[in-house]
């Protein structure tokens, strides 16, 4: 039985040419986490795996830095970047949690971050 | 230049452990990737069978994760397939490779040439 | 694991002509597939990755599309030192799954 639940940043705004820290956490299980996956949309960002470290793709490579953690850094933001953002844990043995972020980019300077909250 | 190449025994015996040797030129095994093993069956299936990491992580595919072990000598550069219990469907021929996980996924780069093995009495 | 279909194992092309090779996952795979080339008593070669991205040194003459969990293989014009047998590959998740090959053989 899937227990876990992961927390995310939510729904959070940023300025164009920033950067933006995503975050998730599982937590409220002993799963042991194998891989996490990094998507937007339907494109993969990252992937961060327990044994083999970090891929980020080649389309996302010059604007996109693994960490803090489990998180990923987007550089460089553009109006382009506004959408959902995905973070895949899979985990043995309960199999696969997903969390989403929404993220918009503005191009004035009132950014702020929405609160967190969970996805079951 | 990395180079890879495999060895072990052409033919194997049902119910017997298959072991095969990848030696590795050009490229510490320690310092960094994931050394792989990889097998292609009569017909030209392919299989994955697992990784063992620059620093001595393994990880197996679950289909043969009973049967399956990876280890290494460091001194000599080389990297080794342990598996037990084997049948004929384990005739195939094997590969090593190596997976840059940084630069292009579970994508592998660099093979040996393969070595045959037949399992039969 | 994730499934790779390859639906044709053969395919007839002419030296010049454009021929592309499919490949549908089972699942979601974003872009995490990779290509390669196995020529006669030979160990495979990785041409393409991340869905489209050509590894070092392969002609520009191979690309990779993807649509969903559609990926496509293309060759624009077809060599005589392109007869062989294409593998994807999705490189998602472990265990890492292929597909069962498509041979490219002249009309």
């Known amino acids: 039985m899937m227990t876990g639940t992961i927390e995310t940043t939510g729904n959070i705004s940023a300025e164009k040419g920033g950067s933006i820290i995503l975050q998730c956490h599982l937590s409220s299980t002993t799963a042991q986490v194998t891989q996490v996956n990094w998507e937007q949309q339907d494109q993969l960002l990252a992937i961060c795996n327990a044994d083999l470290g970090w891929h980020i793709s080649p389309s996302f490579k010059d604007r996109v830095a693994p960490g803090p953690g489990l998180g990923l850094t987007l550089q460089s933001l553009t109006v382009n970047d506004t959408g959902e953002y995905f973070c895949i844990y899979h985990t043995y043995p309960d199999g696969t949690y997903t969390g989403r972020i929404f993220l918009e980019v503005l191009e004035s300077s009132v950014a702020e971050h929405g609160a967190r909250f969970q996805i079951p | 230049d990395v180079q890879l190449q495999e060895s072990g025994p052409g033919l194997v015996k049902p119910s017997q452990s298959l072991s095969l040797t990848c030696t590795v030129t050009g490229y510490s095994i320690t310092s960094d990737y994931a050394w792989i093993w990889i097998r292609q069956f009569p017909g030209n299936k392919v299989e994955w069978m697992g990784y063992?990491?620059?620093?001595?992580?393994?990880s197996y595919n679950p289909s043969l994760k009973s049967r399956i072990s990876f280890t290494r000598d460091t001194s000599k550069n080389q990297f080794f397939l342990q598996l037990t219990s084997v049948t004929t469907e384990d005739t195939a021929t094997y590969y090593c490779?190596?997976?840059?996980?940084?630069?292009?996924?579970?994508?592998?780069?660099?093979w040996g040439q393969g070595t045959s093995v037949t399992v039969s009495s | 694991d994730i499934v790779m279909t390859q639906s044709h194992k053969f395919m007839s092309t002419s030296i010049g002509d454009r021929v592309s090779i499919t490949c549908k996952a089972s699942q979601h795979v974003s872009t995490a597939v990779a290509w390669y080339q196995q020529k006669p008593g030979q160990s495979p070669k990785l041409l393409i990755y991340s869905a489209s991205y050509r590894y070092t040194g392969v002609p520009d003459r191979f690309t990779g599309s993807r649509s969903g969990t559609d990926f496509t293989f293309t060759i624009s014009s077809v060599q005589a030192e392109d007869l062989a047998v294409y593998y994807c590959q999705q490189h998602y998740i472990t265990p890492y799954t292929f597909g069962g090959g498509t041979k490219l053989e002249i009309k």
């Open positions: 490779a190596r997976l840059d996980f940084g630069n292009y996924g579970g994508a592998m780069d660099y």
């Open positions: 063992i990491t620059s620093s001595g992580s393994t």
